[in-house]
């Protein structure tokens, strides 16, 4: 659920990391209403996820490590 590049809510599905190619952090103090992680999928979709959920942190951690190792 996003509007003008801002997430307004979060997905209620758990995404598998194999479908995710990257992410962007949305910060509530930078012009948007809520903190969010925006996952970018292989199908060029943007999915808003709750940064306070374990699965979200886990995928962010995996993607961050991938970038570090490149």
């Amino acid at each position: 659920a996003s509007n003008f590049d801002c997430c307004l809510g979060y997905t209620d599905r758990i995404l598998h990391p194999k479908f995710i190619v990257g992410f962007t952090r949305q910060l509530a103090n930078e012009g948007c209403d809520i903190n969010a992680i925006i996952f970018h999928t292989k199908k060029k979709l943007s999915v808003c996820a709750n940064p306070k959920q374990t699965w979200v942190k886990y995928i962010v951690r995996l993607l961050s490590k991938k970038v570090k190792n490149m």
Partner: antibody, heavy 120, light 110 residues
Framework: QVQLQQSGAEVKKPGSSVKVSCKAS????????ISWVRQAPGQGLEWMGG????????DYAQKFQGRVTITADESTSTAYMELTGLRSEDTAMYYC?????????????WGRGTMVTVSS | QSVLTQPPSASGTPGQRVTISCSGS????????VNWYKQLPGTAPKLLIY???QRPSGVPDRFSASKSGTSASLAISGLQSEDEADYYC???????????FGGGTKVTVL
């Protein structure tokens, strides 16, 4: 009732490796994260790493990277933690803990622990 | 040295109220939920509080928790002998990109 059944105590020589198992029953194994947390005698809790079985990808704390391997067998609802290059500082109680995927860092069920003693 | 700082010990007499603090930073407590664990001697930790202040079923309402900014606290009111244990705060640290625990606080019932 969810239970995490861990393998028995181990005594190991320095330089060797240990593999601890954690069998889950009474819940949907794949729908949770399984973390491994260790506690040296008289010390606090330390996260070693974890796995989300449905993802099939393990992740490790930097301190243990390269020495620890965490795996999960969905067919038997069992998670494993292998630690190599054991040293005396690895003497500790090793716990597996079940974490909620949708609530952060919440380990709602724990195994009883496996005591690993490293001694020559 | 733990990322989350807890006092090593706290004590009180039966019936008293004891508060345990957990101090963190803007990369952990301030932006992520805090959980508390109770560990009786010789046993595995047990979830006491999740999502900053929620109690799992079976945890007495004598246990309460709160969070403000970069600090969290656990309060035990009407202290009982069975409350004698080690208490750990835990959260996620976005800088370290992983779960972190406090050093633990040993509560003694005098």
């Amino acid at each position: 009732q969810v239970q995490l059944q861990q393998s028995g105590a181990e005594v190991k020589k320095p330089g060797s490796s240990v593999k601890v198992s954690c069998k889950a029953s009474g819940g949907t194994f794949s729908s949770y994260a399984i973390s491994w947390v260790r506690q040296a005698p008289g010390q606090g809790l330390e996260w070693m790493g974890g796995i989300i079985p449905t993802f099939g990808i393990a992740d490790y704390a930097q301190k243990f990277q390269g020495r620890v391997t965490i795996t999960a067998d969905e067919s038997t609802s069992t998670a494993y933690m292998e630690l190599t290059g054991l040293r005396s500082e690895d003497t500790a109680m090793y716990y597996c803990a079940r974490g909620q995927l949708e609530r952060l860092g919440e380990y709602d069920y724990w195994g009883r622990g496996t005591m690993v003693t490293v001694s020559s | 040295q733990s990322v989350l700082t807890q006092p090593p010990s706290a004590s009180g007499t039966p019936g008293q109220r004891v508060t345990i603090s957990c101090s963190g930073s803007s990369s952990n407590i301030e932006i992520n939920t805090v959980n508390w664990y109770k560990q009786l001697p010789g046993t595995a930790p047990k979830l006491l509080i999740y999502s900053d202040y929620q109690r799992p079923s079976g945890v007495p309402d004598r246990f309460s928790a709160s969070k403000s900014g970069t600090s969290a606290s656990l309060a035990i009111s009407g202290l009982q002998s069975e409350d004698e244990a080690d208490y750990y705060c835990a959260t996620w640290d976005d800088s370290l990109n992983g779960p972190v625990f406090g050093g633990g606080t040993k509560v003694t019932v005098l």
